[in-house]
């Protein structure tokens, strides 16, 4: 009995035409939503003039349906037992699951103004940029609609720059009609313990963003893992959103629609400083903002974002050091709401439910040559938004799963 089940599982989790895994892998049967909460700044003038604490109030959720598009350019390579693909990006607004419309306005950091002196550190250049910022009537903060903030708007300051640069700015710009990849993953045909593990991303085995082993692309994309998952295992996966590989550890056993699953959680030490977790030393790439690598809970992903001062954290700076959250008022980190977890069915290794939570922040620093920023007395890592991307196996699929997998084992 057990041998037969194991044999069936091994056959059905292979990523090739005709298997259960392949069908769900090409186009997920799960409806995936991405909820956004925007941090609306309540005291923009006070901050710009007096370098006060930034008072924020989160507004949301604003919900989009994502990951509804099938993988494309799927190519099997029988030589090395891999399958390559790209994942198209798309987002559809869901008004019924949102607190308002895409036209709702928010006061947020001016992304272009904040980034300019970070990207252009030369003082001559900053003088030129300052004149363009003033000419465009831009300031430290701006009011933007949800749609503009997420998906892009023509920036008035950048529109005055005489160089052929992109003048469109948005937290996720460009998104619709773009693809993530190329991913090349092992199909498991020769070795089931490697199924879905990423062999390369964008044609490379390393990211070129981090020094040393931090730069490695480890594990799967978290949608599934090699079968027969044990509680003692550390699940490693790569997330292009945060430009790094990360890991999850066993948290608890739960029942998901009658299916026993293991809940794997991202541990706090994944975001720890090198002082607390020496393994993280290569994720600390600069010494000033990180207070000589003693700060924790934020990840500088600028190298992955064309040098823009983008920092990723958990929502509300959960698991972040006090120095990071001290200049911001209105944050209420909460483990249940703000942590990331994966509910993995241990026999197949399929992720049947997940919640990916992360926050996008922008660093803004005092800049003597930029009038909009010259009154700042300290750097701020400014929260822009946080997101909760969730997916749960549908009732019908769950029944089918129980019949075909867990039911047979019982």
């Amino acid at each position: 009995g057990d041998m037969l089940i194991e044999k069936t599982i091994k056959r059905e989790v292979v990523l090739e035409e005709g298997t259960t895994a392949f069908k769900n892998w090409v186009k997920t049967g799960t409806t995936v939503y991405r909820q956004f909460w925007i941090f609306d700044v309540q005291n923009p003038d006070d901050v710009a003039k007096n370098s006060s604490k930034i008072k924020v109030k989160q507004r949301g959720p604003y919900t989009y349906r994502v990951r509804y598009l099938a993988k494309e350019n799927i190519t099997q390579d029988p030589e090395d037992h891999t399958v390559s693909f790209v994942q198209p990006n798309g987002a559809i607004f869901e008004p019924s699951l949102s607190v308002g419309t895409e036209d709702d306005n928010f006061t947020v950091l001016n992304l272009a103004v904040a980034a300019a002196p970070h990207i252009y550190q030369n003082s001559f250049v900053q003088v030129v940029l300052n004149s363009l910022i003033k000419k465009s009537k831009s300031s430290m903060f701006q009011t933007r609609s949800l749609k503009e903030l997420l998906w892009g708007y023509k920036d008035p300051f950048l529109s005055l720059v005489p160089y052929p640069i992109s003048t469109t700015v948005g937290v996720f710009y460009p998104y619709n009609d773009t693809v993530d990849g190329v991913y090349k993953v092992f199909n498991g045909k020769d070795n089931i313990s490697k199924v879905a593990i990423i062999e390369s991303y964008k044609g490379k085995r390393n990211l070129s963003y981090w020094p040393s082993y931090c730069d490695m692309i480890n594990g799967t994309d978290a949608a599934s893992f090699p079968p027969f998952v044990e509680k003692s295992r550390t699940l490693r996966f790569f997330s292009s959103d945060i430009c790094r590989s990360i890991y999850a550890v066993f948290g608890s056993e739960i029942d998901l629609k009658g299916i026993p699953v293991y809940r794997f959680v991202l541990p706090a030490n994944a975001f720890a400083s090198p002082l607390q977790n020496p393994d993280n030393h290569c994720f600390c790439t600069e010494k000033v903002i990180s207070n000589n690598c003693t700060s924790y809970g934020v990840l500088d992903i600028g190298k992955c974002k064309e040098g823009k001062p983008v920092y990723i954290s958990l929502p509300h700076f959960l698991h972040a050091s006090p120095d990071v959250s001290e200049p911001i008022e209105g944050l209420h980190p909460n483990e249940d709401e703000h942590r990331t977890y994966l509910d993995v069915e241990p026999i197949t290794g399929f992720t049947l439910q997940f919640a990916k939570r992360l926050q996008v922040n922008i660093l803004v620093k005092p800049a003597r040559k930029i009038e909009a920023l010259k009154n700042l007395k300290r750097p701020y890592i400014v929260p822009i938004l946080w997101l909760n991307e969730t997916g749960t196996i549908g009732d019908e699929k769950a029944e089918m799963f129980k019949t075909q997998v867990t039911g047979k084992i019982k």
Epitope: N122, V125, V128, L129, V161, P162, Y163, E306, G307
Partner: antibody, heavy 119, light 112 residues
Framework: DVQLQESGPELVKPGASVKISCKAS????????MHWVKQSHGKSLEWIGY????????GYNQKFKSKATLTVDNSSSTAYMELRSLTSEDSAVYYC????????????WGQGTTLTVSS | DVVMTQTPLSLPVSLGDQASISCRSS???????????LHWYLQKPGQSPKLLIY???NRFSGVPDRFSGSGSGTDFTLKISRVEAEDLGVYYC?????????FGGGTKLEIK
């Protein structure tokens, strides 16, 4: 003082590729755009494109987009231009030139690299 | 593309004379940010071009004050008040207001 030292003359066959280098010294390499300019024999100058070493951002003259690829190696303060699918039309002197600080002028130029494409 | 037309093609002068080179663009060089990115370069025989004037009328550091630039919109002029031997070469105007940035065809300043 600012200096841009370009690689030596190149003689290549049609259809081949070539990579020209420009080593910068005397300033912070990552702070300034680096431009490339073409001068065909006895002719005027043509702007090819630029690269910003800080983040590798590029801007191209559309005419050269499929001909030239601009890259940098910040560790050695060197800018590179690769020219591909070479024809006799690509025979020229190629200059690297430093941006003067965001006012679209070139304040320092390399000595030029002569490229000859001939079978 | 913006076409930059320089006149004359060749300018024979005597040392000590005044020289004037004209540059006309096929469209206005006033950028949407209000600046006019019209610059002048000199290329001496066997050398790389050198910047003389930037943004119509600003002399680059080390450039003698006998060089001056003027103009607006589509019409620009470079003047050399008293030509010296070291001024001989080809003068190019350049526009950086519209991508792709373009150079004029050049004006050769030579001894009469």
């Amino acid at each position: 003082d600012v200096q841009l030292q370009e690689s030596g003359p190149e003689l290549v066959k049609p259809g081949a590729s070539v990579k020209i280098s420009c080593k910068a010294s005397g300033y912070t390499f990552t702070d300034y755009n680096m431009h490339w300019v073409k001068q065909s024999h006895g002719k005027s100058l043509e702007w090819i494109g630029y690269i910003y070493p800080y983040n590798g951002g590029t801007g191209y003259n559309q005419k050269f987009k499929s001909k030239a690829t601009l890259t940098v190696d910040n560790s050695s303060s060197t800018a590179y231009m690769e020219l591909r699918s070479l024809t006799s039309e690509d025979s020229a002197v190629y200059y690297c030139a430093r941006d003067g600080g965001y006012d679209v002028y070139f304040d320092y130029w390399g000595q030029g690299t002569t490229l000859t494409v001939s079978s | 593309d913006v076409v930059m037309t320089q006149t004359p093609l060749s300018l024979p002068v005597s040392l000590g004379d005044q020289a004037s080179i004209s540059c006309r663009s096929s469209q206005s060089l006033v950028h949407s940010n209000g600046n006019t990115y019209l610059h002048w370069y000199l290329q001496k025989p066997g050398q790389s071009p050198k910047l003389l004037i930037y943004k119509v009328s600003n002399r680059f550091s080390g450039v003698p004050d006998r060089f001056s630039g003027s103009g607006s919109g589509t019409d620009f002029t470079l003047k050399i008040s008293r030509v010296e031997a070291e001024d001989l070469g080809v003068y190019y105007c350049f526009q950086g207001s519209h991508v792709p940035w373009t150079f004029g065809g050049g004006t050769k300043l030579e001894i009469k």
